[in-house]
């Protein structure tokens, strides 16, 4: 059933028109070619459509000669350019990603069949749903000028101004599939900027082609105000390389997009060189600003830096006589003020008001380096007191009432001697388990201890054990971090193992061997020896994502995500940097729940002395990364099955 009436018209083109119609009880799109359209054009499109069957390509259902027509599946949500112009609000980050992924999937399939598409643009991307986990979201349409390509490439100038590669626009130059990759880069740019460039292109059509051909496209984030998306921005740059050989292939583009990290890495900020960040703390989630305080410096000086995540503005000042090792944010709701407490290597506790940096003073000096700080929140109500807890390198735990941080030279309420010079108190942690709301845990030397709001030690667990087998040498090492859920997860100096201890039985109940997981990932490449891997797998930091995942950062720059309930590996983010230093969850203004990961990159500097320059790098991750890994894996699996089914059907 088919009527060439204006109300059924879906679109017009140089070839003819597309109408909504019914075919075998299904809604379809019928492409009617102009009377003067050559049969060659129809045949060409037929050849392509008949031989290619893929979830990312519009399927041909039937064809007719009089009138010349193609019957194809109908995309209920229209074209991508319509969405970009009329319904930007629907374009969530996940949906943006899935559209790009599906188009890249179709493109690599066409390229594997030696076909250059030559007219990739938002108008030719059709949408079937806006549900981001649907198996079919976007498909490539309009094969009018797709062409089989011999190894040498083709010469004719085709495509649409503003959406084509420089070598295509120039004409009379041989080009190949890499021209489509350039167009894909533009498509990705348009998805990221929700079509800002296209709107301007309609106003200034002459400049539209010029800008993109000359590689003068404005920075998507600065110019169009879209949220940063580091790995997508990088991919756009790669696709838009002037030299086609320098662009990734469509298969490589698909592989890059097929990554949860790409979706969830929302910021990557390089800090000034040789600012070696030791610790960080995020501003209170009630704050309007998404900002972070960073503690750094060298042995003889301490720097406190402030980073505004919205503007990426960075300020730094020397505040102490020695390196800052730890930071805490003390929020006083009654006074409606917040203070940053810096613990230094020399034992100084420096307190600075977050609103007025001139308001600053020191508390009573500690007897050794301040190795950890924690502002507990035993009570969210103001009736019960909250405390600032200070751990030192000589094993002491100093307890300050939170309100006293405002007072110069304030002394602690109480000092507990838990360890000694050989056993530093390295970490303090609150349980994420709701049944243990008022319990704090810490690590001192090789012991784990717990206490509640009366500050009497409840449990003292000695973690020296002969059960570490090949890692027995690390059993005597000092604990550097403890995180607590239903179990205790501890990491020790230089050890590549996370020990899991049962709180009730006080026994070792599991080992998470990072070397094992890293070897699984790198076994194909056979990259590193066991010793090297043990060193690069040494655990530097742990972070618990409640009821979801354990994040492990290693000294070799890898991030491991483990499912909390099964302790199975979800993902290894391999060689993320040279060394991971700090990981913490935060609620940052409009960024909502995020994981902040701070790492170091070492670069060899020029010159004869192979001195390594260290650069700190802060990354912000969407907290949903563990879920996204699993969602994307499922998504890809479903699409693989679909592609296989379509391939089998076409053979039959």
């Amino acid at each position: 059933e088919f009527e060439q009436a204006p109300e059924f018209l879906l679109g017009d083109g140089s070839f003819g028109s597309v109408y909504r119609a019914a075919y075998e009880g299904e809604e379809v799109a019928v492409k009617i070619f102009n009377k003067h359209t050559s049969l060659r054009l129809l045949r060409q499109e037929l050849v392509v459509l008949c031989h290619l069957h893929h979830p990312s390509l519009i399927s041909l259902l039937a064809a007719g000669i009089r009138p010349r027509m193609l019957v194809m599946e109908l995309a209920s949500k229209g074209s991508l350019d319509r969405l970009l112009q009329q319904d930007k609000a629907s374009l969530t980050r996940t949906l943006q990603h899935r559209i790009a992924l599906h188009v890249a999937d179709g493109l690599r399939y066409l390229h594997s069949a030696m076909i250059i598409y030559r007219d990739l643009k938002p108008h030719n991307v059709l949408l079937f749903t806006l549900y981001p986990n649907a198996a079919i979201i976007a498909k490539i349409a309009d094969y009018g000028i797709a062409q089989y390509c011999c190894r040498m490439g083709i010469k004719t100038s085709e495509g649409t101004p503003g959406f084509r590669a420089p070598e295509v626009a120039r004409g009379n130059v041989i080009y190949n599939q890499q021209a489509d990759v350039y167009s894909f880069g533009l498509l990705l740019y348009d998805i990221l900027t929700t079509g800002g460039r296209i709107v301007e292109g309609l106003k200034f059509p002459n400049e539209f082609d010029e800008l993109e051909i000359q590689g003068k496209l404005p920075d998507p984030v600065k110019e169009y105000g879209c949220a940063p998306w580091p790995m997508v921005e990088k991919l756009i740059k790669q696709c838009l390389k002037e030299n086609p050989q320098e662009r990734p292939t469509s298969a490589q583009v698909f592989d890059i997009l097929n990554s949860a990290e790409l979706v969830c890495l929302t910021r990557r900020i390089l800090l000034p060189k040789n600012v070696i960040v030791e610790c960080m703390v995020a501003t209170h989630h009630n704050s309007r600003n998404a900002s972070i305080w960073l503690g750094c410096g060298h042995t003889d000086r301490g720097q406190l830096s402030f980073l505004d995540l919205n503007t990426e503005g960075y300020t730094s000042e020397e505040v102490a006589d020695s390196r800052i090792l730890c930071l805490a944010l003390v929020h006083l709701p009654v006074e409606k003020e917040s203070w940053i407490v810096s613990g230094t290597q020399s034992g100084t506790l420096l307190v600075i008001n977050t609103e007025d940096g001139k308001k600053r003073h020191t508390l009573e000096k500690m007897t050794d380096s301040v190795t950890c700080l924690y502002c507990n929140s035993f009570s969210k109500q103001s009736k019960q007191k909250n405390f600032l807890l200070v751990g030192t390198a000589d094993g002491k735990l100093a307890i300050f009432e939170d309100k006293t941080v405002k007072l110069k030279g304030a002394a602690p309420l109480k000092i507990l001697n838990i360890g000694n010079v050989s056993t530093p108190l390295m970490c303090l942690s609150e349980s994420t388990n709701s049944t243990e709301r008022n319990v704090m845990w810490g690590g001192c030397g090789t012991k784990i201890f717990s206490f509640s709001n009366d500050f009497t030690i409840q449990k003292l667990i000695e973690t020296r054990t002969s059960q570490l087998f090949s890692y027995a040498a690390f059993s005597d090492s000092n604990i550097i971090t403890v995180v607590v859920d239903t179990a205790l997860y501890i990491a020790k100096q230089n050890s590549p193992v996370v020990e899991v201890w049962d709180k009730k039985t006080e026994k070792l109940c599991g080992l998470i061997d990072c070397v094992h997981f890293l070897r699984e990932v790198t076994v194909k490449e056979n990259k590193e020896s066991k010793h090297k891997m043990s060193y690069s797998g040494r655990v530097k930091t742990l972070c618990l994502q409640k009821n979801t995942a354990l994040w492990i950062g290693t000294g070799g720059g890898h991030i491991l995500l483990l499912d909390l309930s099964t302790r199975r590996l979800i993902r290894v983010i391999y060689n993320f940097c040279n060394s991971v230093r700090v990981m913490m969850t935060a609620q940052l203004g409009s960024l909502k729940n995020v994981m902040l990961v701070l790492g170091y990159n070492r670069k060899n500097t020029e010159g004869t002395q192979k001195q390594k320059e260290i650069q700190s790098c802060l990354t912000v991750w969407d907290i949903n990364l563990p879920h996204e890994v699993q969602n994307l894996e499922k998504h890809i699996e479903v699409r693989k099955e679909l592609a296989e089914k379509m391939r089998r059907t076409s053979v039959e």
Epitope: E278, H298, L325, S369, D394, M426
Partner: nanobody
Framework: QVQLVESGGGLVQPGGSLRLSCVAS????????MGWYRQAPGKQRELVAL???????NYGDSVKGRFTISRDNAKNTGYLQMNSLKPEDTAVYYC???????????WGQGTQVTVSS
Amino acid sequence: QVQLVESGGGLVQPGGSLRLSCVASGTIYAINRMGWYRQAPGKQRELVALITLGGGTNYGDSVKGRFTISRDNAKNTGYLQMNSLKPEDTAVYYCKVESSGYTDVFWGQGTQVTVSS
């Protein structure tokens, strides 16, 4: 990466003295604590002495009153002055350094000390 080189070991008669040095080099941005440990054949490695950044010290029971640990922060060097040496002090002496917020640990290759007449 921090490299540690120990020196000053050797053969000494009972009652004699030796001074061990440990020099740290490489990517150093903060050395927190320096320590000396020793391992005699067939025995476990044990703490000899430890010094904090502020100069706080800790000694193994068997060397208290005879050994003194010190450090020169400007030179990234640690020292162990060993007096009234006994045959049971014979061991390989290792230097250990903690860097970067106490989470990184680096060990030297060791220097042999033999006390014998």
